[in-house]
Amino acid sequence: LLVSQGVLLKCQKGSCSNATQYEDTGDLKVNNGTRRNISNKDLCASRSADQTVLCQSEWLKYQGKCYWFSNEMKSWSDSYVYCLERKSHLLIIHDQLEMAFIQKNLRQLNYVWIGLNFTSLKMTWTWVDGSPIDSKIFFIKGPAKENSCAAIKESKIFSETCSSVFKWICQY
């Protein structure tokens, strides 16, 4: 499925709601061309929770959650705090469908911070909610060591130095 910039993916009204923050019309706004063959039906699946969730202005809605894409760049820790200040958290990706949604809404091809870092205490990659990464779903390219934080690029997860500055995504 090739989608040009600005096109709206139509979802069946009543079974799937929009990803924009204004009204439940069943439209998923796409800000960038897709790089994967994820079908319209797939993107609209399992989103009945959207019926009861309305997001703030500037936040996108998908599967009952709200997402905000930054335009500026910060370190991982500064990005983490930025999201906390807005009572949200850095992005936690649950599956490939969510990854596809994120990728469709990224406005550039550069690295973007997500809510995953390597904790020396647990010696493992951990999401900001404390849960471990599911290695059956996601593979992290790069070193697993102290001061490593995760960034996504073209639907892949990379290990980067936490002090590097990238854009980021908040979620609530």
Epitope: Q56, S57, Y82, E85, K87
Partner: antibody
Framework: SLEESGGDLVQPEGSLTLTCTAS?????????MCWVRQAPGKGLEWIGC????????TYYTSWAKGRFTITKTSSTTVTLQMTGLTAADTATYFC?????????????WGPGTLVTV | AFELTQTPSSVEAAVGGTVTIKCQAS??????LAWYQQKPGQPPKLLIY???TLESGVPSRFKGSGSGTEFTLTISDLECADAATYYC????????????FGGGTEVVVK
């Protein structure tokens, strides 16, 4: 609980610093400490907030920027510095704490302190 | 600028009656809205947060509803103690968050 202090009678164009002191908890957690004012017989007016986490970020309403400054001065005190005061700034000033949970809400308020210009 | 418009500014109702107060946001704020009750000489008291969640200890006669830009506070089975001014307060999660209040609604109980 929270308690405001420093309210006083001040001359026009004067300055004043109000202090909000917490008891029973400290500002070591990450949440917002905010200032709200209420002119006599009028409604509540949000002034600004400071995030008590590591960033110490401050946010103000448009009219307060440059004239009002919120600072965390210790683990239990937050101040509101006011300059260029006019008669329109005459009000009861409240400090309030946002809970720090996923929802936004001011669940702890001080009794207020009166500023007269 | 993000603003909240509260209506009516004043409402009168009898004991046992019902009062409805509306709050309109100038932009979508999801469910990030709280309601407060204030009596003369006292600080505001939190009633409802998250648009519809009742604060602990607040009677279930107080009900919040709405999302996006339209919100409502309904007080049923009015009691004399409900005579107060009620304020809505919203939050925007923008790059520079603000927490404005609505103009307030005075509730007079007959």
């Amino acid at each position: 609980s929270l308690e405001e202090s420093g309210g006083d009678l001040v001359q026009p164009e004067g300055s004043l610093t109000l202090t909000c002191t917490a008891s029973g908890f400290s500002f070591s957690g990450s949440y917002y400490m905010c200032w709200v004012r209420q002119a006599p017989g009028k409604g509540l007016e949000w002034i600004g907030c400071i995030y008590t986490g590591s960033s110490g970020s401050t946010y103000y309403t448009s009219w307060a920027k440059g004239r009002f400054t919120i600072t965390k001065t210790s683990s239990t005190t937050v101040t509101l510095q006011m300059t260029g005061l006019t008669a329109a700034d005459t009000a009861t000033y409240f400090c309030a704490r946002d809970t720090g949970t996923t929802n936004w809400r001011y669940n702890i308020w001080g009794p207020g302190t009166l500023v007269t210009v | 600028a993000f603003e909240l418009t509260q209506t009516p500014s004043s409402v009168e109702a009898a004991v046992g009656g019902t009062v409805t107060i509306k709050c309109q946001a100038s932009q979508s704020i999801g469910s990030d809205l709280a309601w407060y009750q204030q009596k003369p000489g006292q600080p505001p008291k939190l009633l409802i947060y998250g648009a519809s969640t009742l604060e602990s200890g607040v009677p279930s006669r107080f009900k919040g509803s709405g999302s996006g830009t339209e919100f409502t506070l309904t007080i049923s089975d009015l009691e004399c103690a409900d005579a107060a001014t009620y304020y809505c307060q919203g939050t925007d999660r923008s790059s520079a968050p603000t927490w404005p209040f609505g103009g307030g609604t005075e509730v007079v109980v007959k």
